[in-house]
Interface confidence: low
């Protein structure tokens, strides 16, 4: 339904608070080094100027595309060019190629300061004092350092912020109320934000036939007493949201989410039974519980798949009359029947479905020819089950810390190219999936561990992108989305791999790693691990062990030494030759 | 092989109800998509009503909006068309058609099985 003023339409359908907020959110995600205040000097003007429109929508340039009038906006600032360099090229393009550049400019990993949490007092005093900027800034940093974070759902993130501070900054404890629910806030954020960069890798990288086959797999796992009708329109319309999220577009997105939250509740009779709860939530919680539901109890008698799928005479005729709508049907049966199948992994046997009928259907004897596709099935299910089942061991044998050390090593070892930090950050995510998932029983382990490696090993992908340096990362992360984790399974040692110098400066440790947190003391000990493997790639695990063990005696011992920058001299020369010793280096 | 079998069309005057059924056979009848369409002398068939596999979603042409009603009884394999309001222009022989996996409900062309029609005239 077109309107005469896109602008004052979305201002009427969202209000003033979310449109402001969605804008700035949109700002910062696009010029991600500019200072809070110009962002919000930029947003007051489009604010002000959207309220013209809602007055008149035939006012001067009301008419124009929200990218138009964004774009014009974001142009405006006078240290584009020395900010951010070529971006500032986008402002000669026209719409839509100058958004489509925009969106080419977004850096996963940009080289802003770490957040620090200041003092619980300073904060609850900051908050008091203006609480309106202090959720703005919340958006803004976060928007700034996640600029695929899925906007609707940062707004529902900045409400449990206010909640948290409206709650606590009067509780006789202010701290132990609130320093909880900020730490809980920040993880979730972290893995909400990484989830929807998988979204956005799937369908700019991938396209919109790869997004909706993975959204009718996980909505019929979902829901899977709702008819293939259903499912079909629900993912229709969850990819709307998502390209138009992905692409810059959150004020649509925002409206089309709620439109969508809106539907699933008015027709929650056909959709699943789960719904209940959430629907008689608020927008923003609604939104959000709708898109965590359980999965709703899969229908009694199921007739078996074969039928359809295998026996019938028409598979073909059905095949090549409507492709992709029958695979899409196929999808669906399957995933409805396995809750315990990865979302990743329904697609791989979908996919193998579908290279059997095109290369049968051609076959002289078609029914013969795909009559045993189901058994190629079996291996692409058993590995998955056979990597948790012996990685969950190995958790349960290790622990996080020294699980997450393990593969630290394995990745090292993989991809010794991938720089320290990115090593280690990823490592340190792919190791939490033993505490995320490996406490589940059996039937919920696959669904949870392999789609949350899917979210994790994507983090690797896109901040290989930005500095591509190991030609064996490109290929996992380029060549198919639903491979990329037994692609990386299946590397080896990198045998090309020339190790690096040996820089004595790298294991130089000082006093300062005794004030850390533990989280911050493990980084340390693991950016070192990654450091010698990256040295002496052949180094077994027992050597490595040694190493590691001689090095936390070592920040043990001096953390509690009386002179301690005096110990981590002297101590640590002698570490370093020992490992030196130990290592053959 | 789905068999579909249409019964109930007959004469009746403007503004008279006339009620069609579909009996199915041969097939797991609550998986198929179930379709009414029609063809009048000399034009080409077209939409008229359509229902999804249980009984959630139904679809109707423009035209017989608010006049026709498909439902169907899965536990009887049968499909019904009730038609108020009848008007000289409905004057076709109405087929029952079946679809097992389908994109648009409106498209004859996404159904795999079709009955042999039932005559329906409109006349005073």
């Known amino acids: 339904d077109a309107h005469k003023s896109e602008v004052a339409h979305r201002f009427k359908d969202l209000g003033e608070e979310n449109f402001k907020a969605l804008v700035l959110i949109a700002f910062a995600q696009y010029l991600q080094q500019c200072p809070f205040e110009d962002h919000v000097k930029l947003v007051n003007e489009v604010t002000e100027f959207a309220k013209t429109c809602v007055a008149d929508e035939s006012a001067e340039n009301c008419d124009k595309s929200l990218h138009t009038l964004f774009g014009d906006k974001l142009c405006t600032v006078a240290t584009l060019r020395e900010t951010y360099g070529e971006m500032a090229d986008c402002c000669a393009k026209q719409e839509p190629e100058r958004n489509e550049c925009f969106l080419q400019h977004k850096d996963d990993n940009p080289n802003l300061p770490r957040l620090v949490r200041p003092e619980v007092d300073v904060m609850c005093t900051a908050f008091h004092d203006n609480e309106e900027t202090f959720l703005k800034k919340y958006l803004y940093e976060i928007a700034r350092r996640h600029p695929y974070f899925y906007a609707p759902e940062l707004l529902f993130f900045a409400k449990r912020y206010k909640a948290a501070f409206t709650e606590c900054c009067q509780a006789a404890d202010k701290a132990a109320c609130l320093l909880p629910k900020l730490d809980e806030l920040r993880d979730e954020g972290k893995a909400s934000s990484a989830k929807q960069r998988l979204k956005c890798a799937s369908l700019q990288k991938f396209g919109e036939r790869a997004f909706k086959a993975w959204a009718v797999a996980r909505l019929s796992q979902r829901f899977p007493k709702a008819e293939f009708a259903e499912v079909s329109k629900l993912v229709t319309d969850l990819t709307k949201v998502h390209t138009e999220c992905c692409h810059g577009d959150l004020l649509e997105c925002a409206d089309d989410r709620a439109d969508l939250a809106k539907y699933i509740c008015e027709n929650q009779d056909s959709i699943s039974s789960k719904l209940k709860e959430c629907c008689e939530k608020p927008l923003l919680e609604k939104s959000h519980c709708i898109a965590e539901v359980e999965n709703d109890e899969m229908p009694a008698d199921l007739p078996s798949l074969a039928a359809d799928f295998v026996e019938s005479k028409d598979v073909c005729k059905n095949y090549a009359e409507a492709k992709d709508v029958f695979l899409g049907m196929f999808l669906y049966e399957y995933a409805r029947r396995h809750p315990d199948y990865s979302v990743v992994l329904l697609l791989r046997l979908a996919k193998t479905y579908e290279t059997t009928l095109e290369k049968c259907c051609a076959a002289a004897d078609p029914h013969e020819c795909y009559a045993k596709v189901f058994d190629e099935f079996k291996p692409l299910v058993e590995e998955p089950q056979n990597l948790i089942k012996q990685n969950c061991e190995l958790f349960e044998q290790l622990g996080e810390y020294k699980f997450q050390n393990a593969l630290l090593v394995r990745y090292t070892k993989k991809v010794p190219q991938v720089s320290t930090p990115t090593l280690v950050e990823v490592s340190r995510n792919l190791g939490k999936v033993g505490s995320k998932c490996c406490k589940h029983p059996e039937a919920k382990r696959m669904p949870c561990a392999e789609d949350y490696l899917s979210v994790v090993l994507n983090q690797l992908c896109v901040l290989h992108e930005k500095t591509p340096v190991s030609d064996r990362v490109t290929k996992c992360c380029t060549e198919s989305l639903v491979n990329r984790r037994p692609c990386f399974s299946a590397l080896e040692v990198d045998e090309t791999y020339v190790p690096k110098e040996f820089n004595a400066e790298t294991f130089t440790f000082h006093a300062d790693i005794c004030t850390l947190s533990e989280k911050e003391r493990q980084i340390k000990k693991q950016t070192a691990l990654v450091e010698l493997v990256k040295h002496k790639p052949k180094a077994t695990k027992e050597q490595l062990k040694a190493v590691m063990d001689d090095f936390a005696a070592f920040v043990e011992k001096c953390c509690k030494a009386d002179d301690k920058e005096t110990c981590f001299a002297e101590e640590g020369k002698k570490l370093v030759a020992a490992s030196q010793a130990a290592l053959g280096l | 092989e789905v068999q579909l079998v249409e019964s109930g069309g007959g004469v009746v005057q403007p503004g008279g109800s006339l009620r069609l059924s579909c009996a199915a056979s041969?097939?797991?009848?609550?998986?198929?998509?179930m379709g009414w369409f029609r063809q009048a002398p000399g034009k080409e068939r077209e939409f008229v009503a359509a229902?999804?596999?249980?009984?959630?979603?139904?679809y109707y042409a423009d035209s017989v909006k608010g006049r026709f009603t498909i439902s169907r009884d899965n536990s009887k394999n049968t499909v019904y068309l009730q038609m108020n309001s009848l008007r000289p222009e409905d004057t076709a022989l109405y087929y029952c058609?079946?679809?097992?996996?389908?994109?648009?409900?409106?498209?004859?062309?996404?159904?795999?099985?079709w009955g042999q029609g039932t005559l329906v005239t409109v006349s005073s």
């Open positions: 058609a079946a679809s097992r996996f389908t994109s648009w409900y409106t498209a004859d062309y996404e159904y795999d099985y």
């Open positions: 041969g097939g797991t009848f609550s998986t198929y998509v």
């Open positions: 229902i999804s596999q249980n009984s959630i979603h139904t």
